[in-house]
């Protein structure tokens, strides 16, 4: 069919979830089956992710939105948008290329992924250690003998564990 | 083919409302959406709602939340009840089906006579 052009862009009304149709003289055509478009104006949809073997879907695709996968259990995500998904290892263990190992003597990991910490160092801050670390629990921070009074109790549990990769807030 | 027929045009006041049908028959089996667009004189033909066979349906925003796109599939007829009229939605509107996707277009693309909407006081 012959129509007039409009001096804007034709393709500037296709909303999200249409594409401007380059086979149908511009016109906005819905995206094909297992495609999205989640802005308007686009000249094609993208194809829709999908979550296979060691993923598994957390949302569909739609016409509008990618689909966005997790990971099977036994296993976390690691990147934007869950890109890899990595074995889970029991607390007291890490990671390495070999598989899981438990963490060395002096060091300790309290979730399913992440690295081994080195348990805190009580007597950098002039304490004791209160209760003994362990593969899977930091060390307990206590009072130095001097800094019992009568009747005062001053127990510092250490700061609480960071994941790898985050700043503190 | 596919032959699509419209119906339910007219004249209305502006905030009336309009039921436009689209029966459609033929080779019904392989259309992956339904699809109204509207041409007002002398400019573009522009989407107005779509509804693929799974359901799923996508409105352009001037229409968002005053025109609903559904269809019935025992008697091959898609609607698209339109609410709160204005002056602006005065166009021919066509009814518009798409074939499955080939991977570089869709496979067939037929359309209505069209019906004219007037909104108008």
């Known amino acids: 069919f012959e129509r007039t052009r409009s001096l804007q862009d034709p393709c500037s009304n296709c909303p999200a979830g249409t594409f401007c149709d380059n086979n149908r003289n511009q016109i906005c055509s819905p995206c094909p089956p297992n495609s999205f478009s989640s802005a308007g104006g686009q000249r094609t949809c993208d194809i829709c992710r999908q979550c296979k073997g060691v993923f598994r879907t957390r949302k569909e695709c739609s016409s509008t939105s990618n689909a966005e996968c997790d990971c099977t259990p036994g296993f976390h995500c690691l990147g934007a948008g869950c890109s890899m998904c990595e074995q889970d290892c029991k607390q007291g263990q890490e990671l390495t290329k070999k598989g899981c190992k438990d963490c060395c003597f002096g060091t300790f990991n309290d979730q399913k992924r992440g690295i081994c910490r080195p348990w805190t160092n009580c007597s950098l801050d002039g304490k004791s250690v209160l209760v003994n670390g362990t593969k899977e629990r930091d060390v307990v921070c206590g009072p130095s003998p001097a800094d019992l009074s009568p009747g005062a109790s001053s127990v510092t549990p250490p700061a609480p564990a960071r994941e790898p990769g985050h700043s503190p807030q | 083919a596919v032959q699509l027929v419209e119906s339910g045009g007219g004249l209305v006041q502006p905030g009336g409302s309009l039921r436009l049908s689209c029966a459609a028959s033929g080779s019904i089996f392989s259309i992956y959406a339904m699809v109204w667009y509207r041409q007002a004189p002398g400019k573009q033909r522009d989407f107005v709602a779509s509804i693929t066979s799974g359901g799923s349906t996508i409105y352009a925003d001037s229409v968002k939340g005053r025109f609903t796109i559904s269809r019935d599939n025992a008697k091959n007829t898609t609607y698209l009840q339109m609410n709160s009229l204005k002056p602006e939605d005065t166009a021919v509107y066509y009814c518009?089906?798409?074939?499955?996707?080939?991977?570089?277009?869709?496979?067939?693309?037929?359309w209505g006579q069209g019906t004219q909407v007037t909104v108008s006081s």
């Open positions: 518009n089906s798409l074939g499955s996707w080939d991977g570089e277009r869709y496979e067939y693309d037929y």
